[in-house]
Interface confidence: low
C-alpha cells in the first residue's frame, strides 16, 4: 500500500492576512485565525512530518479584500509560489478581471500547474493562453506519480469575466476523455480537483470513471467527521464518501473557504491504484499555529502599499453589520439594508415638485454581499473594510423596469431557496412577502414599493404595467445571478457610481450608522 | 492586421453635440474593451472613457463625465462616443484604443485620430 | 486620481546613447504601466506593457523595469527613428492617467 496526503484549501478569496473568526478583518490578533503565513506552518509541519504530501487550491483565490483590489492577482501568484502549491484549479472569481486579469499576475508567474480541462479557448485567445493553463498534470510525488485533472464551474460565464473566446464545457463531459488519457499514460491514481460546487464534485465522484478522489470548491462547503471545532456547521462527514456507477467508493473534499482550515486528508492505495482507505478532516487554523515569520515578514512588506487604503476612517457603526452568507442569501441583512439606503441616498434628486424623489426603490443580490463589519473594532469603518464587503468593483446603476420583470426578479430570488444562492434579494425602497410554501415562480404574495408621486412617501401595491425606476448593481442590470429578465427587459440602463464609494460616501455623511432589520423581506405561509 | 479608423470630428460650436464613431477590423472586437483618448494640439494625452467589451464596465474621465458618453455595437465593430456640451477645452485629437479583455488594462493599437475643434 | 509624473520633460541626445526616462506614480500601482512612443502628427504606438513586457513587433532595445511608484523606460543605443514623445500610463485604476511625456530630441 501506498499513503499520500492530500493538503488543501479553496475560495481563499484574497484573506492572505489572518481574519477574524467570521473572515472579516482581525480585529483581536490572540483570537484570528488563518492567513497565509500561518498556513504555510501548519504545511510545513505536515511536509516534514509525513512522506508524500500534495498542497492543492481548488480556485477562487482571486476577489474578496484590498489585496486583490491593489494587486490585482500577482499576491495570488507570489504568495502561492512562497507555500509552493503543487497545482491549482481555475474557480470563476479568477476571470474578475477578464482573461487578461488572470493571465498576466498569475498564469504567467505562477511556478505550480494550474488546471481546468473544461474551459477551451478559441480565436485569438487560443495561441496567447496556449500552455498557460491546462487540463491535467502529472506529479511525481515520492516514487509514485499522481494525476491531477482540473474543473471550473460551466456557469463561470453568467458570475465572471472570461470573454467571449473561452468556451466552458459541461464537467463530466470534459473530464472523462482527459482521465482516460491520463489511464493510457499508465496514471493509476487520480484527483479531480475543481471549481463547480459540492453537488458537482458528488457528481464527478458518481459518474467519471477511473477518478480517485475529488477536491472541490465554490460551494464553501464544510465536510467534517467528529465535533467541528469552530462555527461552521459540517454539511456532512469528511470525508463525504461517494459510491460511483462503477461501485468504487470515492471519497469528496472541500475545506469550507477564506483559508480558515486546511483540508487534510489521508489517501491509501493499492499497488494498482485502488483507495484502500480515506481519512483526516479540516485543520482550524487558529492562533495556537504561529505564523511563519518569513512569510509574515513578506506579508508586511506587501501591506506598506495597501496602508493609504486602510487607515482612514469613513464613519462609525455602533452596531454589528450583518454581511454574512447565512444572513444575506436567506434573509433581510441589515448590511443589505444599509447598502440600499446608501445607494438610495445617492441618488436623490429633487428635480420636480411632484416627486419627492425621482427613485425609490433599491435591488441588492446577498451574492454581492460579501463579508460582515465587526462593530467591536472602535466602530471604525475603512474603505477597507468596504472593500471586503464590496470587492467586485461594480457600480450601483439606475434601470427603469416594468413593474412585471420586478416581480419575475423577485420571484427569481427565491426559486431555490434555501440553497445559499446568491440571487436572493436584499431591498431598499420595497415591502415584500415570500410565501415557501407554493411552487417556484408564485412564491411573492405580497409586493409593495415605496411611492415617488408623493409628499409623504408611503407603501403602494406594484402595478405590472407601471414603470418603475429601481437602483441596483451593474452586475444584475446585466443579468448576473441568473436575472436574465433584468437584462432582457430593462427599459433604460444608466450606468452610476463605484459601489464602494457610494457606501462610504453615505457613511461619511451619516458618521454615525446603526441600520436595523426592520421587515422589508417577510416569510409567511397560508392564504392572503 | 488591426486597423481603428475614427470618424465624426469637424468643427462644432460650445454647447452643441458631435458623435464619433470608430470602425475597427482585424480583430475580435467584441473581445476587447475599447477606449477613447484625447489630446489638445501641442500637449499631452488624456483618457476620455473606457468600455469593456460587453458593455458590463464603464469608466470616464472626471472631466467629461455626465456630458459624454461611450457605447459599442459589436455586431457593426464599432465603438461612439457621443459628445453633449461641448466646450472649447474640448477641442483635440480624438483617438479610438484597443485595450486588453478586462478594461484596465494597457491599450495596444491606436487609430489615427480625428479632430475635434470647438469654436464659436 | 493617480498623478503620473515623467522626467525629465525634454532631452537631447546623440545616436548610440543610452537613454533613461522615470515616470513615478502618486500612488503604488503594481506593474500596471505602460510606455507609448509618439511622433509629429502620428498616434501613439504601444512600446511595453505590465512595466517591463515588450509589445510584439517592438524591437529589444527598448526595455522598462520598476513595480509600486517608480518605473523607467531604457533605450539601450538611441537611433534616428527613436527621437519622438514618450508617454507612460497607469491602468491600476480609473481614471486611466498618462504622464505629461518626455521629448527626445537630437543634440
Known amino acids: 500500500a501506498w499513503e499520500l496526503t492530500i493538503l488543501h484549501t479553496n475560495d481563499v478569496h484574497s484573506r492572505l492576512e489572518q481574519t477574524s473568526e467570521d473572515s472579516s478583518k482581525c480585529v483581536n490578533a490572540s483570537r484570528c485565525m488563518g492567513g497565509v503565513a500561518r498556513l504555510f506552518t501548519k504545511v510545513q509541519q505536515i511536509r516534514r512530518a509525513e512522506p508524500n504530501v500534495l498542497l492543492l487550491d481548488a480556485g477562487d483565490q482571486y476577489q474578496g479584500t484590498i489585496w486583490f483590489t491593489v494587486y490585482k492577482g500577482a499576491e495570488v501568484a507570489h504568495f502561492m509560489n512562497a507555500l509552493r502549491y503543487d497545482a491549482m484549479a481555475l474557480g470563476n472569481h479568477e476571470f474578475d478581471n477578464g482573461v487578461e486579469g488572470l493571465i498576466e499576475p498569475l498564469l504567467k508567474e505562477a511556478k505550480f500547474p494550474i488546471l481546468s480541462a473544461n474551459i477551451k479557448a478559441k480565436g485569438p485567445l487560443a495561441s496567447q493562453i496556449s500552455g498557460l493553463y491546462l487540463p491535467y498534470k502529472v506529479l511525481p510525488v515520492g516514487d509514485e506519480v499522481v494525476g491531477i485533472v482540473g474543473y471550473t464551474s460551466k456557469e463561470t460565464p453568467f458570475l465572471s469575466n472570461p470573454g467571449t473566446n473561452l468556451v466552458f464545457e459541461d464537467e463530466i463531459t470534459a473530464l472523462q476523455p482527459e482521465v482516460d488519457k491520463l489511464k493510457t499514460l499508465n496514471v493509476n491514481k487520480i484527483i479531480a480537483l475543481g471549481h463547480s460546487g459540492f453537488e458537482m464534485d458528488k457528481l464527478i465522484a458518481q459518474k467519471v470513471r477511473g477518478v480517485d478522489v475529488v477536491v472541490g470548491g465554490h460551494s464553501n462547503t464544510f465536510l467534517y467527521t467528529g465535533n467541528p471545532p469552530s462555527k461552521e456547521v459540517p454539511a456532512g462527514k469528511y470525508p463525504f464518501i461517494v459510491t460511483s456507477d462503477d461501485g468504487r467508493k470515492v471519497p469528496v473534499v472541500q475545506a469550507y473557504a477564506f483559508g480558515k482550515y486546511l483540508g487534510y486528508l489521508k489517501i491509501e492505495f493499492d499497488e494498482r491504484g485502488n483507495v484502500i482507505s480515506s481519512h483526516g478532516n479540516p485543520i482550524l487554523l487558529n492562533s495556537s499555529i504561529p505564523e511563519d515569520p518569513s512569510i509574515k515578514a513578506d506579508i508586511n512588506k506587501w501591506r506598506i502599499k495597501l496602508d493609504n487604503y486602510s487607515t482612514q476612517e469613513l464613519g462609525k457603526t455602533i452596531v454589528y453589520l450583518d454581511g454574512s452568507s447565512q444572513s444575506c442569501r436567506f434573509r433581510e441583512c441589515n448590511m443589505g439594508n444599509l447598502i440600499c439606503d446608501a445607494m438610495i441616498n445617492n441618488n436623490l434628486r429633487h428635480t420636480d415638485e411632484m416627486f419627492w424623489n425621482h427613485v425609490s426603490m433599491c435591488i441588492l443580490n446577498g451574492g454581492g454581499i460579501r463579508s460582515p463589519i465587526d462593530e467591536r473594532n472602535n466602530g471604525t469603518i475603512t474603505w477597507e473594510n468596504l472593500a471586503a464587503v464590496l470587492p467586485f468593483g461594480g457600480t450601483f446603476d439606475l434601470v427603469q423596469l416594468k413593474g412585471s420583470t420586478l416581480k419575475k426578479a423577485f420571484e427569481h430570488s427565491v426559486h431555490r431557496y434555501g440553497q445559499s444562492t446568491g440571487e436572493f434579494l436584499q431591498v431598499g425602497g420595497i415591502h415584500v412577502v415570500y410565501d415557501l410554501s407554493r411552487k417556484p415562480g408564485d412564491r411573492v404574495v405580497k409586493l409593495d414599493v415605496l411611492c415617488t408621486k408623493c409628499r409623504v412617501p408611503s407603501y403602494d401595491p406594484l402595478k405590472m404595467d407601471e414603470v418603475y425606476k429601481v437602483i441596483l448593481p451593474n452586475f444584475l442590470a446585466n443579468g448576473g445571478d441568473g436575472f436574465q429578465m433584468i437584462k432582457d427587459e430593462l427599459l433604460r440602463h444608466d450606468s452610476g457610481d463605484q459601489d464602494i464609494n457610494v457606501v462610504s460616501t453615505y457613511i461619511s455623511k451619516m458618521k454615525v450608522i446603526y441600520p436595523a432589520v426592520e421587515g422589508r423581506i417577510k416569510f409567511s405561509t397560508g392564504s392572503h | 492586421e488591426v486597423q481603428l479608423v475614427e470618424s465624426g470630428g469637424g468643427l462644432v460650436q460650445p454647447g452643441r453635440s458631435l458623435r464619433l464613431s470608430c470602425v475597427a477590423s482585424g480583430f475580435t472586437f467584441d473581445d476587447y474593451a475599447m477606449h477613447w483618448v484625447r489630446q489638445a494640439p501641442g500637449k499631452g494625452l488624456e483618457w476620455v472613457s473606457g468600455i469593456s467589451w460587453n458593455s458590463g464596465s464603464i469608466g470616464y474621465a472626471d472631466s467629461v463625465k455626465g456630458r459624454f458618453t461611450i457605447s459599442r455595437d459589436n455586431a457593426k465593430n464599432s465603438l461612439y462616443l457621443q459628445m453633449n456640451s461641448l466646450r472649447a477645452e474640448d477641442t483635440a485629437f480624438y483617438y479610438c484604443?484597443?485595450?486588453?479583455?478586462?478594461?484596465?488594462?494597457?491599450?495596444?493599437?491606436w487609430g489615427q485620430g480625428t479632430l475635434v475643434t470647438v469654436s464659436s | 486620481d493617480i498623478q503620473m509624473t515623467q522626467s525629465p520633460s525634454s532631452l537631447s541626445a546623440s545616436v548610440g546613447d543610452r537613454v533613461t526616462i522615470t515616470c513615478r506614480a502618486s500612488?503604488?500601482?503594481?506593474?500596471?504601466l505602460a510606455w507609448f512612443q509618439q511622433k509629429p502628427g502620428k498616434a501613439p504606438k504601444s512600446l511595453i506593457y505590465a512595466a517591463s513586457s515588450l509589445q510584439s513587433g517592438v524591437p529589444s532595445k527598448f526595455s522598462g523595469s520598476g513595480s509600486g511608484t517608480d518605473f523607467t523606460l531604457t533605450i539601450s543605443s538611441l537611433q534616428p527613428e527613436d527621437f519622438a514623445t514618450y508617454y507612460c500610463q497607469q491602468y491600476n485604476s480609473y481614471p486611466l492617467t498618462f504622464g505629461g511625456g518626455t521629448k527626445v530630441e537630437i543634440k
Open positions: 500612488q503604488g500601482i503594481s506593474n500596471y
Open positions: 484604443a484597443q485595450g486588453g479583455y478586462a478594461i484596465l488594462t494597457a491599450l495596444e493599437y
